[in-house]
Interface confidence: low
């Protein structure tokens, strides 16, 4: 049988009673000789093909219990006719056997007289008939075939005889094995009950583990249910808090960069003005009026308009307002608020543990009391009483069997000796026939006359006639033995062995009021004095065969209902009522008004409305109107084209100044522009869809807040119920298992069914009836064939 299933008990949490090992095999293997037994069964089926006569047997048994039987009653006559009809095959065989018994001695006697008067064969002919040799051959072959058939029959007899001896010897061991199994049943049962009780502690430990770790089991369950709706929102807010910090950093960087740029640009502008002034002053040199220097000077004068700083760098709007806004936003510690949110979630298991200390203690008290209740119930089980009574019966039966086994073995020796004599006698007859045939064939001389034939040939004839004589003397005695064993063996096989195997015999015994006219069901009347309770031999035998427990097999629930006494519902109800007082209050903090305002302020801080393109446009432009290095080199080249003197030197000095301006002014501006670009990009990324993001986060926040407001209590209730179901599940499962084990597994009555099988199926049918039937089948066949043998021998 399987385990009782409990929906809430963990699947892996299965109990198993330790297996009880029994010694006795519950089926008997005949071995190769089984083929011979099957042959007899086939013969019996031919002789007796009708189904087991349940009704006839019932009526017969009812008549047998009557004190005085009226044979003239029609129903008695009909019953008699039914018995005759069923036994027709056997009766017919008996009639033929009786004819054989009566006729064989008479025929033998007359044949002997006839032979003595030289009338019945044995006369000597001078000349052979034409068909004489052919007839002789036919007779010899026929006799040989018949002798072989007789020999097979004798072989069957020997085998059967040997089987009886060896099998009866095995009976003692078989009986001991059965009694050992019955003792095992008696001894194991208290151990099984102890084991069942011990499993309560295992169950209780499992529940205690869950109770002790209520923080992770219940708290964790609640947390797992809430997490998916809250953590994503907190994560989003956390990422927004990071974004605010990054924005502040970017704005600060941008601000300082812009300030640097303004200063650097002004300085560049100032420097370029100075150098332009210097160049203009240089170009006032009189040399510039003289050709070809005048062209160079004009070229330089024209190029001066290029020496301008990019004025737009100084016009880039500030980000003070945005930075102020972000700084205001950062006054609220959004990170801290988010952390509070996470913390309030992570605190759930501990809060659950703190709030359930009393309830857990209460449940533990209930669980401890259930243990003692179960102990009381198992103490009162009637299994022990039945087993005690059964123990007495087992002891009596064992001593009875041990007392009578020597007698059985003694009778078996007589049977074996008788069988040996019978088989030996038949063997002697068939040996004479074989010798007669052998001598006849070996000593035959077709030219010799009857008076001059050889000694061997003559001896052959003598052997044949001795065989015939012995056949006439003993075959009728053998047939008596065959008929008697046949009637007994065939009826036992047909009326006990076969219906026992098919359980039809149990159905007869289960007939209401049959074995006791006061009891509807014999077994329940005998065991419990409650004959109305349906307890049948067939059901008890089948249940025991299936290894079912005594409690379930004998329907002990009628005298002690374990379900009522265990009262699963009452126990689980006690746990449930304790669990009902399990109340958990959670305070989950999400963000609060300050946090919400913080997000809204950040959304309104203006970084999404900044004109990033104007900043980015400037980062791509040159700080000066021209590449100052190129301008300086060009100026140097032009200066070099002038004749040596003040003009040339001052121009070269100015070129050098421009290079310095590039180095000291332009390069730092380019560096600042690169920094500005990075800051703008960060801000652009953060500002992109900021309002939508914050709106979405606030919507998620509202959803999460609604979820907490509307669902937290139902989540707690559901998880608490689930937790309760798990705890209760352990005990429901355990109590169902107890019920199942006591009903189906404890004190398995299989040894009883095995003992019955041993007594009927093995001992009676396999050890006695099968060899007995093979014996009469073999000897009967040999005896029957003695008749044609003696005819052909004569």
């Amino acid at each position: 049988g399987g385990q009782p299933s409990s929906t809430d008990a963990p699947k892996a949490w299965n109990y198993e009673l330790p297996a009880t090992n029994y010694e006795t095999q519950d089926s008997h293997k005949a071995g190769p000789i089984g083929i011979l037994f099957e042959l007899v069964h086939i013969f019996l089926y031919v002789v007796q093909p009708r189904d087991f006569p349940e009704d006839t047997l019932r009526k017969f048994l009812q008549k047998a219990y009557e004190s005085k039987i009226d044979y003239d009653k029609p129903e008695t006559v009909i019953l008699g006719l039914k018995i005759v009809y069923y036994e027709a095959g056997i009766i017919l065989c008996c009639v033929l056997g009786l004819l054989f018994i009566i006729l064989m001695p008479l025929v033998g006697y007359f044949f002997c007289m006839c032979r003595c008067c030289n009338k019945c064969g044995g006369e000597m002919h001078q000349r052979q008939k034409e068909n004489g040799p052919f007839l002789r051959k036919c007779f010899a072959i026929s006799l040989l075939v018949i002798c072989i058939i007789i020999s097979i029959g004798i072989f069957y007899g020997f085998v059967a005889n040997h089987q009886v001896r060896t099998r009866i010897k095995r009976s003692r061991k078989l009986a001991d094995s059965n009694f050992k199994d019955l003792r095992t049943l008696l001894n194991e049962t208290p151990e099984q009950i102890k084991y069942i009780l011990a499993q309560y502690n295992t169950t209780k430990d499992k529940a205690f583990t869950d109770l002790n770790s209520i923080n992770s089991v219940l708290g964790g369950g609640i947390l797992d249910r809430l997490r998916p709706n809250i953590i994503p929102v907190l994560d989003e807010i956390k990422s927004m808090a990071t974004a605010i910090k990054e924005t502040k950093e970017a704005l600060e960087n941008m601000n300082s960069t812009l300030k640097s740029l303004h200063q650097q640009s002004t300085q560049l502008s100032s420097s370029l003005t100075s150098v332009k002034t210097s160049l203009r002053s240089s170009l006032n040199d009189p040399l510039c009026l003289v050709h070809p220097s005048s062209e160079t000077c004009n070229s330089i004068r024209l190029s001066l308009s290029q020496l301008n700083s990019n004025p737009e760098l100084r016009q880039l709007p500030p980000v003070d307002a945005e930075l102020d806004n972000v700084n205001n936003v950062l006054r609220t510690d959004l990170d801290g608020l988010v952390q509070q949110g996470y913390q309030s979630l992570n605190d759930i298991p501990d809060r659950v543990q703190r709030q359930t200390t009393t309830v857990v203690a209460g449940i533990k008290r209930v669980l401890n009391s259930i243990g003692s209740d179960i102990d009381n119930v198992t103490q009162r089980l009637p299994i022990q009483d039945i087993l005690s009574a059964f123990s007495v019966y087992v002891n009596n039966t064992e001593s009875y069997i041990h007392r009578n086994l020597p007698t059985l073995e003694e009778y078996d020796s007589y049977w074996w000796l008788g069988g040996l004599v019978i088989c030996s006698l038949l063997t002697l007859i068939v040996i004479f026939y074989y010798l007669g045939l052998l001598c006849g064939v070996c000593g035959y001389d077709r030219h010799a006359t009857p008076t001059t034939r050889g000694c061997v040939s003559n001896t052959g004839g003598v052997f044949l006639m001795v065989g015939v004589g012995l056949s006439f003397l003993f075959c009728w005695i053998l047939m008596i033995i065959v008929v008697l064993t046949f009637v007994f063996g065939a009826n036992v096989e047909k009326l006990i062995c076969e219906p026992y195997t098919s359980k039809e015999l149990f159905r007869v015994l289960d007939t209401p009021y049959l074995l006791n006219e006061d009891w509807e069901y014999y077994l329940s009347g005998k065991l419990f004095n409650k004959s109305k309770m349906k307890l049948t031999f067939e059901q008890v035998y089948s249940d025991c065969k299936k290894n079912r427990g005594t409690y379930g097999t004998l329907h002990l629930q009628n005298s002690f209902n374990i379900s009522e006494h265990l009262n699963i519902n009452e126990h689980t109800g006690s746990i449930s009522s304790e669990l009902e007082s399990l109340k958990v209050n959670l305070n989950i903090f999400l963000l609060g008004a300050a946090g919400r305002k913080n997000l809204q302020d950040f959304a309104a801080c203006g970084i999404d409305r900044m004109n990033y393109d104007s900043y980015l446009a400037q980062t791509g432009k040159s700080p000066a109107g021209v590449n100052l290095l190129s301008f300086a080199y060009d100026l140097e080249a032009k200066a070099n084209s002038l004749p040596p003197g003040n003009l040339r030197n001052s121009l070269k000095r100015d070129a050098q100044t421009i290079k310095t301006i590039h180095q000291q002014r332009v390069l730092p501006i380019e560096q600042s522009l690169s920094t500005l670009y990075q800051s703008v990009k960060i801000l652009q990324r953060t500002g992109n869809g900021l309002l939508e993001r914050v709106t979405r986060i606030l919507a998620s926040l509202d959803f999460a807040q609604n979820f907490i407001t509307n669902n937290t209590s139902s989540v707690i209730i559901e998880e608490t119920k689930k937790y309760g179901r798990t705890i209760i599940g352990y005990f429901e499962h355990y109590l169902q298992w107890i019920e199942f084990s006591i009903s189906e597994k404890v004190a398995s009555c299989k040894p009883v069914a095995t003992a019955l099988d041993t007594a009927v199926d093995v001992f009676l049918c396999s050890y006695i009836i099968d060899p007995l039937n093979l014996f009469w089948f073999g000897i009967g066949k040999a005896t029957v064939f003695l008749l044609p043998a003696l005819i052909f021998a004569v």
Epitope: L258, K259, Q263, T266, Q267, S270, T273, E312, Q315, D320
Partner: antibody, heavy 117, light 106 residues
Framework: EVKLVESGPELKKPGETVKLSCKAS????????MHWVNQAPGKGLKWMGW????????SYADDFKGRFAFSLETSASTAYLQINNLKNEDTATYFC??????????WGQGTTLTVSS | DIVLTQSPAIMSASPGEKVTISCSAS?????MYWYQQKPGQPPRLLIY???NLESGVPARFSGSGSGTDFTLNIHPVEEEDAATYYC?????????FGAGTKLEIK
Amino acid sequence: EVKLVESGPELKKPGETVKLSCKASGYTFTDYSMHWVNQAPGKGLKWMGWINTETGEPSYADDFKGRFAFSLETSASTAYLQINNLKNEDTATYFCATDYGDYFDYWGQGTTLTVSS
Amino acid sequence: DIVLTQSPAIMSASPGEKVTISCSASSSVSYMYWYQQKPGQPPRLLIYLVSNLESGVPARFSGSGSGTDFTLNIHPVEEEDAATYYCQQYHSYPPTFGAGTKLEIK
């Protein structure tokens, strides 16, 4: 709140030297350039020049090169304007102003300098 | 240096009227700034980058223009608006101010 507080009115004789101060508060001093603007009585505003508060490097308008000097005391968040060899035409109100690029967003209350023999 | 010419130099207006002050640059500039100065006080920034209103400045002030011609409008003018108004550029070094327009309220 950003504040620029200038030193009190000054009365000087020609040829003397004066040092006007401008104390900044409410922001990081080195973040903004400091400019000086002059306003002669009944006249318009005239830009004198500026000082890079990060590097301390001054830059002067053409009309104010020579006798005028800008300096800093960064630790005290203070900028100074020193005028040497004062002349009667130096009589004016002197403003310090921080710039945010192309314009002057915060101004000191102004220091009145009177040069008279 | 870029020269800024403001017109008119002096003007008067009654409360509720619309006042327009012009500023003309000697060469093209990208941006223009406007300041208000009351007697005994430092200048106060009104408009930056041609048309942007500085925080705290009433909405009746507005700026417009491009290239060399820029305008400051006050509508409706109020008594407290009596002051001298300056335009300023920093497009080209050095920064320069206009000579100022004095607004009187009748």
